[in-house]
């Protein structure tokens, strides 16, 4: 929870919290959700997930953690399905409101059948 001094009351903020390790290992053909919770005030205006400079238009959902009017906490999930070896790399979540922008990156490693990562 960010501390707010009297002179900063009107200044907005966004804090992002990863809900899965930011380094993710999956085997090829497997599925994984990349998940963040984030606090945003004022309310978030734009959210996007990006991979290789391309924005996902689907495969993700974004929802408030509570339906209370005073809620400032949100969840965003990117659903990656049947991952191929060529789909490893950096996946980035970006969110902005009228005051600030914030981002978090996930490094996804897809292990091919010939080289499995051991947990």
């Amino acid at each position: 929870q960010p501390s707010v001094s009297p002179g900063e009351v009107d200044k907005g903020f966004i804090n992002i919290f990863p809900m899965i390790n930011t380094t993710v290992f999956v085997n090829d053909g497997e599925n994984v959700d990349l998940i963040v919770e984030y606090e945003a005030f004022p309310k978030p205006e734009h959210q996007q997930w990006i991979y290789m400079n391309r924005t996902f238009t689907d495969k993700w959902e974004d929802y408030p953690k509570s339906e209370n009017e005073s809620n400032i906490r949100y969840v965003s999930e990117l659903h990656l399905t049947r991952l191929k070896g060529t789909e490893g790399g950096t996946y980035t979540f970006l969110v902005s409101n009228s005051d600030v922008n914030a981002a978090i990156a996930f490094n996804v490693y897809v292990n091919t059948k010939h080289h499995h990562h051991h947990h």
Epitope: V26, E30, N31, E37, H79
Partner: antibody, heavy 120, light 106 residues
Amino acid sequence: EVQLLESGGGLVQPGGSLRLSCAASGFTFSNYKMGWVRQAPGKGLEWVSWIYPSGGGTFQADSVKGRFTISRDNSKNTLYLQMNSLRAEDTAVYYCARVRVGSTGNFDYWGQGTLVTVSS
Amino acid sequence: DIQMTQSPATLSLSPGERATLYCRASQSVSNYVAWYQQRPGQAPRLLMYDTSKRATGIPARFSGSGSGTDFTLTISSLEPEDFAVYYCQQRSYWFAFGGGTKVEIK
């Protein structure tokens, strides 16, 4: 093959505590949300709680909020449910379940359940 | 909170017949409805998710339809192993289950 094996159920007095465990195998546990669902004898299913892959966030049903705590140890591939201040109405079979990727809240694999009986 | 109401409570049918199970949400849940099967003494099994998508390994005789508040699970031709209790569930806001429909042998 995905396997979920619950343990820790039993008879406990009202007001007592119990900790359930669920040992997971056959999948990358640390990549999945996990949850608990319960079923009172002869009744329907009731969602109890679920937890993010990292363990950094949880959701609880109102009926157990403040009394039950879900947690996980990814190094041991194990899910837990700490149940405090137990009531007679908590008597049920408790199922550990994996949350399906891409549809949060749907459970695609279930354990066989462990029975918790709250009675004096 | 969103309530899920299933009907009928019991459905008595013979093998080979078509079964139609209904689920109604107290408010719109988009297409975020799943169906589970629970055989006696067993854990539930996910059949359908997001209204009409079959879960892994579920045979084609199971199908789902609906949107908003009214949903249907259809079993086109009942097999002996299909006699069980079926639950619907919404994931639009939290995760409420319906009370179940028992499909029994007539």
